[in-house]
């Protein structure tokens, strides 16, 4: 909501999760792994990389089925705590200028830092308008105090807020699982909010920094290394 059409393939780590239709976003973090939101879990997912217009085949797409879909063991569907999901692709993505991985964070998100949020979610705060082309939004990371004041009792240490307290610019339904990137690092995953772009109701995002070890451990545990004796 309140964003702009991204320059084509300018967000090369952005993926679309498809189950006959786009239902969530995600981020490519290595040639065979995608991170998304826990509440985007489905038993069958096709990962679509290199997308810009999701309604048109433009020639840069890679459609790869999910081989493994691993939701965080402490995901809570009621509170959306630990709202993170890992997807192992059935075959590695071909990395190129339009499809490439985003780095995991080396430090937690800092208030005031500019970030890029992207996705194919609803672009209206009241009503619906689902775009075909990838939308981008530049937004600042808010302080934890502002975040907690916006959602009293709802914000855990695994969440942070990004956006504008005055409303008007935000992620929305269909953006879940997608990236929040600051300084070339994946700081957030689109998670939840009360409505979209409402005053004093900024978007809430999964704090990826808290899951770097889980991500690395899960990838290691699900990578088959053949040992020759």
């Amino acid at each position: 909501v309140g964003g702009y059409i991204c320059e084509e393939n300018s967000v090369p780590y952005q993926v679309s999760l498809n189950s006959g239709y786009h239902f969530c976003g995600g981020s490519l973090i290595s040639e065979q792994w995608v991170v998304s939101a826990g509440h985007c879990y489905k038993s069958r997912i096709q990962v679509r990389l290199g997308e810009h217009n999701i309604e048109v085949l433009e020639g840069n797409e890679q459609f790869i089925n999910a081989a493994k879909i691993i939701r965080h063991p402490k995901y809570n569907s009621r509170t959306l705590d630990n709202d993170i999901l890992l997807i192992k692709l059935s075959s590695p993505a071909v990395i190129n200028s339009r499809v490439s991985a985003i780095s995991l964070p080396t430090a937690p998100p800092a208030a005031g830092t500019e970030s890029l949020i992207s996705g194919w979610g609803n672009t209206l705060s009241s009503g619906a308008d689902y775009p075909d082309e990838l939308q981008c939004l530049d937004a600042p990371v808010l302080s934890q105090a502002e975040c907690e004041a916006s959602y009293p009792g709802k914000i855990t240490n695994n969440m942070f807020c990004v956006g504008f307290l005055e409303g008007g610019k935000d992620s929305c339904q269909g953006d879940a699982g997608g990236p929040v990137v600051s300084n070339g690092e994946l700081q957030g995953i689109v998670s939840w909010g009360y409505g979209c772009a409402q005053k004093n109701r900024p978007g809430v995002y999964t704090k990826v920094y808290n899951y770097v070890d889980w991500i690395k451990d899960t990838i290691a545990a699900n990578s088959h290394h053949h040992h020759h004796h």
């Epitope: 006959g20 969530c24 339904q173 879940a176 409505g195």
Partner: antibody, heavy 127, light 108 residues
Framework: QVQLVQSGAEVKKPGASVKVSCKAS????????MHWVRQAPGQGLEWMGS????????NYAQKFQGRVTMTRDTSISTAYMELSRLRSDDTAVYYC????????????????????WGQGTMVTVSS | EIVMTQSPATLSVSPGERATLSCRAS??????LAWYQQKPGQAPRLLIY???TRATGIPARFSGSGSGTEFTLTISSLQSEDFAVYYC??????????FGGGTKVEIK
């Protein structure tokens, strides 16, 4: 069970106003958007507008802007649709309809549709 | 405004036969499409949402398909209770929410 119960039939004179109520039961009223749809005799379905019962925010079809007002009373889980300056071509059955899938906080896409409908309220405008 | 066009306006089918109803959108609505059944004197009833997902309690003989601008509702073997008017509706871009004009399925 989940249901929407509407107020009874009305007969109004041209220029008058009508207010139709829609009482929800069996679910959390504030968690689901409510829409209003009308159907003139022998005709198809026409969307009039919607209300977010939680915030009170509304969306009206352009055709009805300035004539329709949608409100709600959360204490009695009831939505209202008031149409003013009635004309004979407003004679129709008026339905309230709930959008399925709670207005969840999570930002995954979920398909929308009117999963529960009221029984309809016949409004006749005649001099 | 997205215009929804249904065809045919009337479909005459014998019980036990297959019925295929069409709905076309003036621009892409993705998979944001629903189908409703309405019988005389009754409120509409949701059959299909998300273009292809059957609503709770809807028999398997009803199926929806399509995406973008072309959609189909198929009733595999018509039962006597299936003779009614069917409407499609888009939820992709609103306001306004728009319905098709309806297809009446009548006994041949």
């Amino acid at each position: 069970q989940v249901q929407l119960v509407q107020s009874g039939a009305e007969v109004k004179k041209p220029g008058a106003s009508v207010k139709v109520s829609c009482k929800a039961s069996g679910y959390t009223f504030t968690g689901y958007y409510m829409h209003w749809v009308r159907q003139a005799p022998g005709q198809g379905l026409e969307w009039m507008g919607s209300i977010n019962p939680s915030s009170g925010g509304t969306n009206y079809a352009q055709k009805f802007q300035g004539r329709v007002t949608m409100t709600r009373d959360t204490s009695i889980s009831t939505a209202y649709m008031e149409l003013s300056r009635l004309r004979s071509d407003d004679t129709a059955v008026y339905y309230c309809a709930r959008v399925g899938g709670a207005a969840a906080a999570g930002k995954a896409y979920t398909a929308s549709a009117f999963d529960i409908w009221g029984q309809g309220t016949m409004v006749t405008v005649s001099s | 405004e997205i215009v929804m066009t249904q065809s045919p306006a009337t479909l005459s089918v014998s019980p036990g036969e297959r019925a295929t109803l069409s709905c076309r959108a003036s621009q892409s609505v993705g998979s944001n499409l629903a189908w409703y059944q309405q019988k005389p004197g009754q409120a509409p009833r949701l059959l299909i949402y998300g273009a292809s997902t059957r609503a709770t309690g809807i028999p398997a003989r009803f199926s929806g398909s399509g995406s973008g601008t072309e959609f189909t509702l198929t009733i595999s073997s018509l039962q006597s209770e299936d003779f009614a008017v069917y409407y499609c509706q888009q939820f992709h871009n609103w306001p306004p929410l728009t319905f098709g004009g309806g297809t009446k399925v009548e006994i041949k």
